[in-house]
C-alpha cells in the first residue's frame, strides 16, 4: 500500500527473510504519513511493513548484520 513512494498502510502477510534483499526506513516526520519499513524482495517488489511488529524488527536486524558483514 504505497503512493508516491510513501507507504499508506502495512502488509498483512509475513515475508520470509530469504526473499528479502534489503529495506528502506520511512519516517512519518519526513514527508510521509506513517512510519514504515519498506522491504525490497528478490522479485523487485517493495512491501510496506509495520516497524513495531517483532517479525519486522527481526528481519531488519538480520539485514543490518548482513550489510555490516559485507
Amino acid at each position: 500500500a504505497s503512493n508516491f513512494d510513501c507507504c499508506l498502510g502495512y502488509t498483512d502477510r509475513i515475508l520470509h527473510p530469504k526473499f528479502i534483499v534489503g529495506f528502506t526506513r520511512q519516517l512519518a516526520n519526513e514527508g510521509c504519513d506513517i512510519n514504515a519499513i519498506i522491504f525490497h524482495t528478490k522479485k523487485k517488489l517493495s512491501v510496506c511493513a509495520n516497524p513495531k511488529q517483532t517479525w519486522v524488527k527481526y528481519i531488519v536486524r538480520l539485514l543490518s548484520k548482513k550489510v555490516k558483514n559485507m
Partner: antibody
C-alpha cells in the same frame, strides 16, 4: 501458559563447547521469538541472541556472535544454544525465554514472560 | 545498540516504604520497556510491559511509568516478598538490552 524445560547442568573444560536445549510445551512454538539470556554469578542479565523458529536464521548480540549458535527444531518444539571456545568467564546460568506476544502482534511488545528454570554451565579445568 | 542505565544499583528500604527505581535509555524507545523481578536461584519474572501495563497476576502495588528515554518502576508499599533484584529491559529494537539491575535490600 507455555512451559520451557531446559537441559541439565553441565561442567565443561576451557576451549570446549556446550549445547543447551529448551523444549516448549503447551503453546504455539514457531510463532514466537525465543531468546537466550545468560547470568554470570552475582551479575546481571545479558541477552545473547534469539530465533523465530519459522525463520530458522538466528540473530545474535555482537558480544557473542562469533561463538554462539542458536537453532530451533519445529518438529520437537525445541530451541538450542551452543557456545564454543568456552572460558572461565562463561560460567553462568543460561536461560531460554519466550516472547509475551507472537511475532505478528501489531504492538510488538516482546517482553519475554515465559522462562526456563535455567541451566548452570560451569567452565573449569 | 541501545544502552540501558538503571539506578540506583542498591536500595535499602523498610516494609511499607514507597520505592522508585529508574531506567534511562541511550535513545528514545517510545514505551518499549519492561520490568522484571528476580529472586536468588530463580528465573526473572515479568512485572510490567509496555512501560506501564501490569502483567497478569502481578500485585497492583507495582506500577510503571515513562516514555521516550526515562522510565520508573514504583512499589507503593513494600512487602517482605518484594526484596529482590529488579531489571529493566528495552524491547524496542534488537538486540534486546537489560539495565544493570537494582538490588532491593531490607534496611
Amino acid at each position: 501458559q507455555v512451559q520451557l524445560v531446559q537441559s541439565g547442568a553441565e561442567v565443561k573444560k576451557p576451549g570446549s563447547s556446550v549445547k543447551v536445549s529448551c523444549k516448549a510445551s503447551g503453546g504455539t512454538f514457531n510463532r514466537y521469538a525465543i531468546s537466550w539470556v545468560r547470568q554470570a554469578p552475582g551479575q546481571g542479565l545479558e541477552w545473547m541472541g534469539g530465533i523465530i523458529p519459522m525463520f530458522a536464521t538466528p540473530i545474535y548480540s555482537q558480544k557473542f556472535q562469533d561463538r554462539v549458535t542458536i537453532t530451533a527444531d519445529e518438529s520437537t518444539s525445541t530451541a538450542y544454544m551452543e557456545l564454543s571456545s568456552l572460558r572461565s568467564e562463561d560460567t553462568a546460568v543460561y536461560y531460554c525465554a519466550r516472547d509475551r506476544t507472537d511475532y505478528y502482534d501489531t504492538d510488538g511488545y516482546q517482553s519475554p514472560d515465559s522462562w526456563g528454570k535455567g541451566t548452570l554451565v560451569t567452565v573449569s579445568s | 545498540d541501545i544502552q540501558m542505565t538503571q539506578s540506583p544499583s542498591t536500595l535499602s528500604a523498610s516494609i511499607g516504604d514507597r520505592v522508585t527505581i529508574t531506567c534511562r535509555a541511550s535513545q528514545g524507545i517510545n514505551n518499549y520497556l519492561a520490568w522484571y523481578q528476580q529472586k536468588p536461584g530463580r528465573a526473572p519474572k515479568l512485572l510490567i510491559y509496555a512501560a506501564s501495563s501490569l502483567q497478569s497476576g502481578v500485585p497492583s502495588r507495582f506500577s510503571g511509568s515513562g516514555s521516550g528515554t526515562d522510565f520508573t518502576l514504583t512499589i507503593s508499599s513494600l512487602q517482605p516478598e518484594d526484596f529482590a533484584t529488579y531489571y529493566c529491559l528495552q524491547d524496542s529494537d534488537y538486540p534486546l538490552t537489560f539495565g544493570g539491575g537494582t538490588k532491593l535490600e531490607i534496611k
